[in-house]
Interface confidence: low
């Protein structure tokens, strides 16, 4: 068992393209940060894997398509959104975030959970920042981003609880 | 609000080297994309590179090899070593902030001024 440091999260959902330059942001302290994470502030648009049966990011050829900003071919920094589970571990979904270039990864909860959170385990994935969110939270910011309304997250480090028992996948 | 403060331009052989830089002030809680645009006489304002939070790095194909842009997070300053400078690289070169908050709408700098001369 091991301490755990909650997640501030900033989030704000933009429709793309209208020209209405409001954007709604929701401040909470809902997510909570890997044991193997780097306790850093990090933020960038969400973006979940490519394709309906891909939100578990288990296969290791899954793709995000990023959207760009600074020119035709340059993504913004972005959020991996994965969905917990789907036989791969933690350490698997982050890695394969960190790959493909997200500057930190944002795990949902299972179905059925509610807006429960656990500790994640995910050593030797330590590059980019990691955090958990509620099943809840996740399944209303990746509707939105279906929808297709751009969604980003602003996370910063919150404060210390525990100890917790750490899960793996 | 952000603010922007640009400095490095001047004038400068073919050939030869300029080192820009570009710091940020402001409302800044976390790290933000930093980048660079140009802008010659007579032509549209123009992507040169761009350095993300993760220090990922983009470039314009006209720059790659000759220029290199890096980051100083604690300073909130982004640079650009520029190398083997051509003439037509002259132009007023802009440092831009990509915020979160604001979509796809940089933060630019007043831009400073690099002249090639061959």
């Known amino acids: 068992a091991e301490a755990v440091w909650t997640a501030y999260l900033n989030v704000s959902w933009r429709v793309p393209h209208t020209g209405v330059n409001r954007t709604v942001w929701e401040l909470s302290e809902e997510g909570v940060y890997g044991q193997d994470s780097p306790l850093e502030p990090v933020a960038g648009v969400l973006v979940p894997p490519d394709g309906p049966g891909a939100l578990n990011a288990c296969n290791p050829h899954t793709n995000f398509t990023v959207p760009t900003v600074w020119g035709s071919t340059v993504q913004v920094s972005w959020l991996a959104l994965i969905q917990r589970g789907g036989g791969c571990t933690f350490a698997d979904k982050i890695h394969l975030a960190y790959e493909r270039g997200a500057s930190g990864a944002v795990i949902f909860n299972f179905p059925g959970t509610r807006n429960e959170v656990i500790p994640m385990s995910h050593p030797g994935a330590v590059d980019i920042v990691a955090i958990m969110i509620g099943n809840l939270k996740g399944t209303k910011i990746l509707q939105s981003i279906q929808r297709g309304i751009q969604v980003t997250m602003v996370i910063e480090v919150g404060k210390k609880h525990g100890p917790w028992v750490n899960h793996y996948s | 609000q952000v603010q922007l403060q640009e400095s490095g331009g001047g004038l400068v052989q073919a050939g030869g080297s300029l080192r820009l830089s570009c710091a940020a002030s402001?409302?800044?809680?976390?790290?933000?994309?930093m980048g660079w645009y140009r802008q010659a006489p007579g032509k549209e304002r123009e992507f040169v590179a761009a350095i993300n939070q993760g220090t990922t790095t983009y470039y314009a194909d006209s720059v790659k090899g000759r220029f290199t842009i890096s980051r100083d997070n604690a300073k909130n300053t982004v640079y650009l070593q520029m190398n083997s400078l051509k003439p037509e690289d002259t132009a007023v070169y802009y440092c831009?902030?990509?915020?979160?908050?604001?979509?796809?709408?940089?933060?630019w700098g007043q831009g400073t001024q690099v002249t090639v001369s061959s």
């Open positions: 402001g409302n800044i809680s976390v790290q933000l994309d």
């Open positions: 831009a902030v990509y915020l979160y908050d604001i979509w796809n709408h940089p933060y």
